[in-house]
Interface confidence: low
């Protein structure tokens, strides 16, 4: 009785921002759930949390300094990460826990999404021109 999670294998964050959609084999409508995004092969860093309760507004937060937002679909949660650094290129795993109504459910570990962060291409300063083209 595990929820299956589907994620894109790879995403590129060109402008230091990315939308990562976690699709679940479970309808989150009228459920109390905690969806989270974890960084690293060992999922050591909890990047962002989306907490849903049918009687309250969606709560989205990060306790690890990430700038994140979340959107809820019937069977998905989309994490919107901004201000990512190049060194935050890593594998990111979606996790879901359904607390209510019972019984408690969580997911089989997904394959994860490699987020490749490409820094903003800043225009070269006129004082320091880039290499000349032949």
């Amino acid at each position: 009785n595990k929820i299956l999670v589907k994620q894109s294998p790879m995403l590129v964050a060109y402008d230091n921002a990315v939308n990562l959609s976690c699709k679940y084999s479970y309808n989150l409508f009228s459920r109390e759930f905690r969806a989270s995004l974890h960084k690293g092969l060992d999922s050591a860093v909890e990047v962002c949390v989306v907490y849903g309760n049918y009687s309250q507004q969606l709560q989205v937060y990060s306790k690890t300094g990430f700038n994140c937002d979340g959107k809820l679909g019937n069977e998905s949660v989309t994490f919107y990460l901004q201000n990512l650094y190049v060194n935050q290129t890593d594998i990111y795993f979606c996790k879901i826990e359904v607390m209510y109504p019972p019984p408690y459910l969580d997911n089989e570990k997904s394959n994860g999404t490699i987020i490749h962060v490409k820094g903003k291409h800043l225009c070269p300063s006129p004082l320091f021109p880039g290499p000349s083209k032949p």
Epitope: N1, S30, P101, P103, Y104
Partner: antibody
Amino acid sequence: EVQLVESGGGLVKPGGSLRLSCAASGFTFSSYTMNWVRQAPGKGLEWVSSISSSSSHKYYSDSVKGRFTISRDNAKNSLYLQMNSLRAEDTAEYYCAREGDIVLIFDPWGQGTLVTVSS
Amino acid sequence: EIVLTQSPATLSLSPGERATLSCRASQSVSSYLAWYQQNPGQVPRLLIYDASNRATGIPVRFSGSGSGTDFTLTISSLEPEDFAVYYCQQRGNWPPTFGQGTKVEIK
């Protein structure tokens, strides 16, 4: 073939106790949430109790809370319902039912065991 | 808890006829409604889950529809083995609850 076979029912006096068992076969028992559902004679169905695959979460209907205890032994592929402080209104056929891949959908069901509470 | 009211209590029909059973919830359960069949002396059998999805092995003559508070089970052409009691069950809110049943009997 998935099979659920209940046992342990019988006649008991009000205030007495009984322990029901459900033997499972034909599927990986330890992977599934299991439930007890009852049916009073000539009446409809009533969900009684639920236990998660690893026994970490147990739930009861208000009508049996504090009197009934659900448990399971995954090594023995068995589900149990310990019923204490039995009342006349607990008289019913008790079915064990597997919760499939969809939460709180009961499929399949065992053949049931009859519990009669009477003085 | 959510109360499910089934109607009619008894439906008298002949084989080959169409049967329409109703289940009304006291508050919305979205599409989280199932139907079970119980033949005399038998155990309940899952027919339909989440309002309109047929369970494995269930004949196409059984169909379900509805959402929110009003649901319908339709048997397009009654076979002799379809004369039984039918229960609806919701899983949209805790605890799961069943309707009181509709008996489909031979006219």
